[in-house]
Interface confidence: low
Amino acid sequence: MMTGTIETTGNISAEKGGSIILQCHLSSTTAQVTQVNWEQQDQLLAICNADLGWHISPSFKDRVAPGPGLGLTLQSLTVNDTGEYFCIYHTYPDGTYTGRIFLEVLESSVAEHGARFQIP
């Protein structure tokens, strides 16, 4: 039975040219996390494998940095980065948990930087 829940940074906004941390946290389960995938719509951004470490998709290598933790940092944001991001936790024995974050990249300086890392 899947008892876990994923907490995310939710809907966040950031300024064009800035950076943002995408953060998910899996709680309420003792399942072992074997891999976390970060995806934007249908594109794979990065993988963090428990045994192999991080792999960043080559097309995003210049603008994506691993962490903190199992999170993902997006840099040099453009308006085209606006959209849905998914953290997909592969766990044993529970299976797959998915969290959703919506990022809006704004032209102006009124963006709220709401992606502070929260300690569970």
Partner: nanobody, 115 residues
Framework: EVQLVESGGGLVQPGGSLRLSCAAS????????MGWFRQAPGKEREWVAS???????WYADSVKGRFTISADNSKNTAYLQMNSLKPEDTAVYYC?????????WGQGTLVTVSS
């Protein structure tokens, strides 16, 4: 039993430097991911820097270019070299082991930046 013990904190003048150490035991340090956090009086604990196996390091914007995180696997110790310290860096600094999340914490070491 997992243990993380921080040291190296103290009182330093603005512009000064400190090197924090985090001695780890009870787990395989060489395949662990370590992070430093800090908590200023009356504020939430915030992430400062992390180092992953494979040499990935990254930093909060507020410390980038001033702080350097590193790890010495032979000594099972993580370090945070802090240069050009500012009064706003005053906080209790904690090291943490990253697993599926930050699952083990040290007791913290106080850094005070004041003239």
């Amino acid at each position: 039993e997992v243990q993380l013990v921080e040291s190296g904190g103290g009182l330093v003048q603005p512009g000064g430097s400190l090197r924090l150490s985090c001695a780890a035991s009870g787990f395989d340090f060489s395949v662990s991911w370590m992070g430093w956090f800090r908590q200023a009086p009356g504020k939430e604990r915030e992430w400062v820097a992390s180092v992953l196996r494979g040499g990935y390091t990254w930093y909060a914007d507020s410390v980038k270019g001033r702080f350097t995180i590193s790890a010495d696997n032979s000594k099972n110790t993580a370090y945070l070299q802090m240069n050009s310290l500012k009064p706003e860096d005053t906080a209790v600094y904690y090291c943490a082991r990253e697993g599926s999340w930050f699952d083990y914490w040290g007791q913290g070491t106080l850094v005070t930046v004041s003239s």
